[in-house]
Each structure stands twice: as C-alpha cells, then as structure tokens.
C-alpha cells in the first residue's frame, strides 16, 4: 500500500507511517514502528504537557517567584502549568503575570474610579467641582463637599478638589 501523506487527528507522520501522539501529561520516549506502538512516559514532578504531543521533554512548571511579588494561584498538574498571581495589594505587570508592582495610590485631588485587582492597576479620576480628596489612597473615592445649608450654617471657606468647605455660623444682625 502507498505510504500515508497525512494522518488522523492525534497521530503524526514519521518514517512514512502514522504514529499515535502522546496524551497530555505524557512525553514521547520512542516513535512507533511497524510492530510497536508509540511509547510514552508520564511527566515528572513539577513538569507538564498540555496538548497531545510528540515532545521528548515535558515543560517545567512556572515558578511563582516571591521576589517578584508572585504567589501560586493554581498549582500545576501533569497536564496544566502553574498559574501565578500577585500578592494582595499588587498587580501584574504583563499579560502572563511575569511580575507584580504595588497598586497605585490616587493623590490628593484625585479619587479612585476603579479599585485595582490582581491583574489591573487602580484607576484614578480628578475630583470634580463639589467633591474633594485630601488623602493619597488606593481605595478612597472623591467625597462630596459638606453641605453647610443643611446644618443651618454658611460657607466660611470654599472647598477645593483637595479640601472640604469650612462651615461657620450665620452672622446675626444686632438689634
């Protein structure tokens, strides 16, 4: 018979014949022959392969380096890699989370629009007229100025984006 030019799914072509790929979690030890099946071996501790493959070496599990602010989010198996995430208060500096940096704080005059997560940084926004923030914070929103009127007081000092209004008693007309 004619040697195959293409093989079925989960097979590969070698020496003019189709051999079975190794299943996820296993690596190739030897190709099949006319008389023998493909020989595969399970990946060792701290190794994995996540696809049907003909790899002769398993991949090393990713190391979540604490020096880079990383910790293990999900432990790897023979078929999956370790997933790293950032320590509390830190966020990833790239899509694959290769390292972490501290969440940004919003300076006075700015409030938190969106609190940081493990993968995205704090989003700050300037406090609009009528609101203020007098602290540098990673979670405080802009606060509304105090309403002097509701306390039967008057504004003695106008508010800014960094300071609240100062209320005081209304001047009484002398008799």
């Amino acid at each position: 018979p004619e040697p195959p030019t293409a093989c079925r799914e989960k097979q590969y072509l070698i020496n003019s014949q189709c051999c079975s790929l190794c299943q996820p979690g296993q690596k190739l030890v030897s190709d099949c022959t006319e008389f023998t099946e493909t020989e595969c071996l399970p990946c060792g501790e701290s190794e994995f392969l996540d696809t049907w493959n003909r790899e002769t070496h398993c991949h090393q599990h990713k190391y979540c380096d604490p020096n880079l602010g990383l910790r293990v989010q999900q432990k790897g198996t023979s078929e999956t890699d370790t997933i790293c995430t950032c320590e509390e208060g830190w966020h990833c500096t790239s899509e694959a989370c290769e390292s972490c940096v501290l969440h940004r704080s919003c300076s006075p005059g700015f409030g938190v629009k969106q609190i940081a997560t493990g993968v995205s940084d704090t989003i700050c926004e300037p406090c609009p007229v009528g609101f203020f923030s007098n602290v540098s914070s990673a979670f405080e929103k802009c606060h509304p100025w105090t309403s002097c009127e509701t306390k039967d007081l008057v504004v003695q000092q106008a508010g800014t984006n960094k300071t609240d209004v100062v209320c005081g008693p209304q001047d009484r007309l002398r008799a």
Epitope: H59, S94, E95, L102
Partner: antibody, heavy 112, light 112 residues
C-alpha cells in the same frame, strides 16, 4: 529560544521570522520581538501575551503582526514594507519587561 | 511609547573601581524596570528585575535601585569582564489597550 534564518530581503517586501521555543509553554509566558540595527541600541518591536493578546511599539503597529502556534511552540513576526532602516539583528525573547531567555538573533539585511 | 533616557555614555572606570549608570523614564513605571548586559555578537543578558532584584546567577557586584521615573545601576569592584554595553528596559501593562515598553539608548562601560 531559537530564531529562523534571516538573510537578504528586498525593499518593500515582507519579512517573516519564526521563533521556536522548547522547555516551556507559550500559553504561560509573554514573548517579545526586539531588534538591533548594526552598531545601534535595542528596540522593542512588540509582544504576544500568554493569553494571546498582541502589543506593538507605535512605530511598528501599522506594519507588524505577531502570531503564535502553541502546538508547534512557535512565535512568528511578519513585518511589511521593509526599507534599509529595517536592516538589523532580530531577537526573540521570553517575557515583557523581564526578558530572561533570548535567542541568538538573526541578521536581516534589506537591500536591492 | 515610554522613553527611557540613559546617561552617561560611555562611562569608564578602573579595575576594582565603581561606575554608575542612570536611567530616566518618561512616565511612572513603578519598579517595572530591567537592566541588561550585552557583549559584541551576543544577545543581551538579564541582570536585574524588578529595579533592584538580582537575576539568578548574577554577581552581587551589580546593584539596581530606584522606582517611579529614576533608576540607577551601580557596578562595584569592576572587572575586565564587565566591559560591555548596558541597557535599561521599562514598561507597564494593565490591559491590551493600556501598556508601554521601551529600551534606553545603552551605556558603554569601558574598564581601564
């Protein structure tokens, strides 16, 4: 990490370079392309993230495409509309701002 | 794109001495900065990331410091083998549309 052979490319042509990796999964790491013109410094071209997102330097965005094949463990850079200014050694490296594994680089010469 | 400005270049120092290289980022990149050493005909080698953390197998004679926009690489007890070009690289990433990455222009270190 190993880049395919570069060589001589004509102006206006498209460059295709392939980077083959082993020992780690492309689904778990970002991969960057960096180039270096003769006698010059390093220049970041772009990257493909562990989840598959693509990122380009502003100068490269309009004429570069980075793709990957996680089954074949390959990352490919295509760059169109080449000029003599694109003559450089092109490196493939693992990471984003922590490029801890580099290929040896491949020299691409753009000339007619 | 992030612009990283390295100074000075070149810089020279005597064997056993100390040299300092500065890197200034155009925007706040927190501690997300790497330092690389490159010798002629070789790919760059990661020395430090992030900002002050020594990469595996790198001599403690190399010291990184700084955060935000100002960073420094100090090489003490200079050896002839330290003669090379040094690059800083910095960036940030929060989403596929909010990112930046770039290299400094490089600083050549001459050891006398």
């Amino acid at each position: 990490v190993r880049e395919s052979e570069g060589g001589l490319v004509k102006p206006t042509d498209t460059l295709t370079l392939t980077c083959t990796v082993s020992g780690f999964s492309l689904s778990s790491y970002d991969m960057s392309w960096v180039r270096q013109a003769p006698g010059n410094g390093l220049e970041w071209i772009g990257a493909i993230g562990g989840a598959g997102g693509t990122y380009y330097a502003s100068w490269a965005k309009s004429r570069s495409t980075i793709t990957r094949n996680t089954n074949l463990n390959t990352v490919t850079l295509k760059m169109s509309s080449l000029t003599a200014a694109d003559t450089a050694t092109y490196f493939c490296a693992r990471g984003w701002t922590r490029l801890d594994l580099w290929g040896q680089g491949t020299l691409v010469t753009v000339s007619s | 794109d992030i612009v990283l400005t390295q100074t000075p270049s070149p810089v020279s120092g005597a064997v056993g001495g100390t040299v300092t290289i500065k890197c200034q980022a155009s925007e706040d990149i927190s501690s997300n900065l790497a330092w690389y050493q490159q010798k002629p005909g070789q790919p760059p080698k990661l020395l430090i990331f992030p900002a002050s953390n020594l990469a595996s197998g790198v001599s403690s004679r190399f010291k990184g410091s700084g955060s935000g926009t100002e960073f420094t690489l100090t090489i003490s007890d200079l050896e002839c083998a330290d003669a090379a070009t040094y690059y800083c690289q910095g960036g940030y990433w929060t989403s596929t549309s909010n990112f930046g990455n770039g290299f400094g222009g490089g600083t050549e270190v001459v050891v006398k």
